[in-house]
């Protein structure tokens, strides 16, 4: 039961995380105008990965896409790439993990196959989460650098003849959404990897075989021989029924009447 719960929870957490990564990638508020020096501005600027927006005193908001590809900063392109890779990996991970879920039965898929798929999706979620966290962090670093550069240049332009305040940008809501979403995807991936350990068929139980030595009648029962899975030893107490080992989690479960979206 614990393995199913861990796997299911990992899937749900990753699903929320990937939805968050998609939302963050689409959001326009990656950077927002810093109002510290100009709290009374009637024109509020904010920027996303794909377009920049201006909210005017009328309440009207105008957004313009970045219609150039080559003219954009390399860092912005890198952030876009990281977020897209994160989304793609996460989406593939979700697809794989759906089939890997214990509560969903597909044909005669063996537990070893489900374990491998769970591990694969877990790794994909981990990489997806790391991509999102890296993308958001790179953008945040870019903002911090530009913020202090613009602060240094704020009163040096135009020889002080014109009172013009250079627009500075600070962290937007999308950064926090991205960090949280990346973290959730990462946690979900770790949970999937942990669930994989419980799914793997860790014990091979042989039926009792009698070896007749000359003059002696000794029976050797190597029923408790462990098959290595690479995930350490299993400490569970397992009952042996007719030479086959099955934990509580491995009891055959039939899909309940639910809609899987």
């Amino acid at each position: 039961m614990a393995v199913t719960a861990c796997q299911g929870l990992g899937f749900v957490v990753s699903l929320i995380g990937i939805a968050g990564i998609i939302a963050a990638t689409c959001m326009d508020q990656w950077s927002t105008q810093d109002l510290y020096n100009n709290p009374v501005t009637a024109v509020f600027n904010y920027q996303g990965l794909w377009r920049s927006c201006v909210r005017e005193s009328s309440g009207f908001t105008e957004c313009r896409g970045y219609f150039t590809l080559l003219g954009l900063p390399a860092m912005l392109q890198a952030v876009r790439a990281l977020m897209i890779v994160g989304i793609v990996l996460g989406a593939i991970g979700l697809l794989v993990s759906i089939f890997a879920l214990k509560c969903i039965r597909i044909g005669s898929m063996e537990d070893s196959a489900k374990a491998n798929m769970t591990l694969t999706s877990g790794i994909m979620f981990i990489v997806s989460g790391l991509c999102a966290i890296a993308g958001v962090s790179v953008f945040a670093n870019m903002l911090v650098t530009n913020f202090w550069m613009s602060t240094a240049n704020m009163y040096t332009g135009m020889g002080g003849m014109v009172q013009t305040v250079q627009t500075r940008y600070t962290f937007g809501a999308a950064l926090f959404v991205g960090w949280v979403a990346g973290g959730l995807t990462l946690i979900g991936g770790v949970m999937m990897c942990i669930a994989c350990r419980g799914l793997a068929p860790e014990e091979t139980n042989y039926k009792a075989v009698s070896y007749h030595a000359s003059g002696h009648s000794v029976a050797y029962k190597p029923g408790g021989f462990k098959a290595s899975t690479g995930f350490g030893s299993n400490t569970k107490n397992k009952k042996i029924y007719d030479g086959g080992a099955r934990t509580e989690d491995e009891v055959q479960s039939y899909p309940s009447k639910h809609d899987y979206v």
Epitope: Q33, T41, A42, V43, N45, Q47, S57, S58, F60, Q163
Partner: antibody, heavy 115, light 113 residues
């Protein structure tokens, strides 16, 4: 078409309050801020502040902040501007305006403060 | 607060002639976010509310005749009427649309010579 229809002229005594209404039609009321502008007889224009019907947010000119209160009722698409503790220099035409670059204006409400 | 200074206070121009009204702001109205200047021009006739002519310093509102044009950047702006018509007699105001409180110029009264 976009229309802003304001309430009728008011005559008030000093120290009293007046509430001017501005009924909007022809556009999504919650999409744009409603601004209020004062014009004293024979004088120029003075911005009082705005109300954002979408979220109830507002911004006031400090000169009016302690006496002006802006509200809105989204169900009737109406914005209100209440001016309290009226003085003789509050005698003016009060306009509501909205749209990009204040493209749409109400016809104005004359408020006369006289003892 | 941003102070808007209009000049001249009044202007008399012959029909068909060019009329030029200037507006100067105490601070730049340029927004680096979209490279636009947030200045508005209005026309007001007696007993009427102001009518929007130009927003963002140079963008003509729909329905405004093309004889009206706006120019300028930063702190200095100009409204030009290329060929004055009788119906253009009015008071013209410029407005800071960049920083709160939104402020208006004192107005320029345009008459026919």
């Amino acid at each position: 078409q976009v229309q802003l229809v304001q309430s009728g002229a008011e005559v008030k005594k000093p120290g009293a309050s007046v509430k001017v209404s501005c009924k909007a039609s022809g556009f999504t009321f919650t999409s744009y801020n409603i601004h209020w502008v004062k014009q004293a007889p024979g004088q120029g224009l003075e911005w009082i502040g705005y109300i954002s019907p979408g979220n109830g947010g507002s911004n006031y000119n400090l000169k009016f902040k302690d006496r002006a209160t802006m509200t809105s009722d989204t169900s009737s698409s109406t914005a209100y501007m209440e001016l309290s503790r009226l003085r003789s220099d509050d005698t003016a035409v009060y306009f509501c305006a909205t749209g990009r670059g204040f493209a749409y204006w109400g016809q104005g409400t004359l408020v006369t403060v006289s003892s | 607060d941003i102070v808007m200074t209009q000049s001249p206070d009044s202007l008399a121009v012959s029909l068909g002639e060019r009329a030029t009204i200037n507006c100067k702001s105490s601070q730049s109205l340029f927004n680096s976010g979209n490279q636009k200047n947030y200045l508005i021009w209005y026309q007001q006739k007696p007993g009427q509310p102001p009518k929007l002519l130009i927003y963002r310093a140079s963008t003509r509102d729909s329905g405004v005749p093309d004889r009206f044009s706006g120019s300028g950047s930063g702190t200095d702006f100009t409204l030009t009427i290329s060929s004055l018509q009788a119906e253009d007699v009015a008071v013209y105001y410029c407005q800071n649309d960049y920083s709160y409180p939104l402020t208006f110029g004192g107005g320029t009264k345009l008459e026919i010579k």
